[in-house]
Amino acid sequence: MSANATLKPLCPILEQMSRLQSHSNTSIRYIDHAAVLLHGLASLLGLVENGVILFVVGCRMRQTVVTTWVLHLALSDLLASASLPFFTYFLAVGHSWELGTTFCKLHSSIFFLNMFASGFLLSAISLDRCLQVVRPVWAQNHRTVAAAHKVCLVLWALAVLNTVPYFVFRDTISRLDGRIMCYYNVLLLNPGPDRDATCNSRQVALAVSKFLLAFLVPLAIIASSHAAVSLRLQHRGRRRPGRFVRLVAAVVAAFALCWGPYHVFSLLEARAHANPGLRPLVWRGLPFVTSLAFFNSVANPVLYVLTCPDMLRKLRRSLRTVLESVLVDDSELGGAGSSRRRRTSSTARSASPLALCSRPEEPRGPARLLGWLLGSCAASPQTGPLNRALSSTSS
């Protein structure tokens, strides 16, 4: 190598990461196997759960503003879940990115796209509910499914825009032990006259901007919307939170718990540029909190189901009935199970004034099983607690 050979310029923290070597420690290998297993399971669960949510909410329910929000959240989570198998592969081959630079950029971008999209969509849901309560007349006139879709498109565009720097500055870096990292390289584009200054300013800018835009601002919007709604409903003498409120509260709590640690470590990482003593903590903690953030996409569909009232009781009670009705022949569909469903349907209709499904006919065979898997939320049109939970938006 010549004296002036251009080594790829790396920020100090990144160069030090490239110097970390793998251990052949047995206990560490067991942890790696467990991590691969856990991420593989999460990949599968995330894809199936979010796929089912998209199918049921998108195809088997009448489209409302609320189902639109859930649909887009599930789409974001499905994208993230679809990228998880590649992260699992990265873990399986010994924490080495073997899929090339372009795919490294794309894979990482999906993670950040999900981060921004989730934050923005949860903000929109909270603002939507706030407007319904604080400006009911305006909401009545302007709150349409088409408008919600347009808002979602704008939010997706904003999320994509915010993801661009993460796409640009993602790179594959060879470690000294032969493994390949897929990580930030903020010196990749126009490093400027002073690398140290560029490293510091860009790392801080990325960490602070994502913390503010994808976490703090959305949580502030959610909190202030909730406060405004609570104040208004207090005046109306309402005490018990509605079903949709519980669903949103659960999803927001999961968002805060899953993404909060990631942002803390991301800020610590930016601080570690000037304070190398923080680096070991960041190196140890970041993989765990990144996985936790990924798992948010797996947790959300579970929350949609679990926030259905009487869910577990209904599941236990209807297990035998559902299995019977799924296994009966199409010619036998006029029997007792069917009439029992029709009775439930009428009570559900009286419980919620809204028609909740775009298909009036009884779903058959696999569709019914899918519905049951979702906790009877969409097993038959216009029944099911999820339908009601997703509809009673002002409660």
Partner: antibody, heavy 118, light 107 residues
Framework: EVQLVESGGGLVQPGGSLRLSCAAS????????MSWVRQAPGKGLEWVAY????????DYPGTVEGRFTISRDNSKNTLYLQMNSLRAEDTAVYYC???????????WGQGTLVTVSS | DIQMTQSPSSLSASVGDRVTITCRAS??????LAWYQQKPGKAPKLLIY???QLASGVPSRFSGSGSGTDYTLTISSLQPEDFATYYC?????????FGQGTKVEIK
Amino acid sequence: EVQLVESGGGLVQPGGSLRLSCAASGFTFSSYSMSWVRQAPGKGLEWVAYISNGGSTTDYPGTVEGRFTISRDNSKNTLYLQMNSLRAEDTAVYYCARHRTNWDFDYWGQGTLVTVSS
Amino acid sequence: DIQMTQSPSSLSASVGDRVTITCRASENIYWNLAWYQQKPGKAPKLLIYAATQLASGVPSRFSGSGSGTDYTLTISSLQPEDFATYYCQHFWITPWTFGQGTKVEIK
């Protein structure tokens, strides 16, 4: 060929000042971080100052902080070390060294001797 | 500050001998260690960087190993030109400190 040539050493009284220079050639000076390292007669090596490639970041060990100042002029391909309030224990051969990347001194000058004595 | 303790401080060996010099840091330095060779009246020369990586133009008889706090420089077959003083230096947290040196002399 990479060359680092130090100059400015000499005899100085305790409490006095001295400015060392290091002329660089054979590489793109503005692309590399630089350091000064010293070696007291018959003793080991001691790192004394660091400066980033653009000059925005400097660092010093506690033994010289506040007394020594590292700087660079990328247009002149020159590194400097301003030494104030010199003490007898600062007597050493001072080397300028180029950082391979962020660390690791891959090229050194031949050194200049600084003697602090009354 | 991180202390670097080199051992032995001096050793006598013959041409063709296998020589091992160790360097212990007072805390984990995560492979951020370099080894230098210095001959009398000359500037130090980089041999090994990042604990295990051979610097450009350095003969393959030199090798580095170790992790955490303990690192080793090995000369597999000592040559006449290898009689010199060897220093380790960490690049973890500033101040970047050197070991006190190991003088390799002819037996």
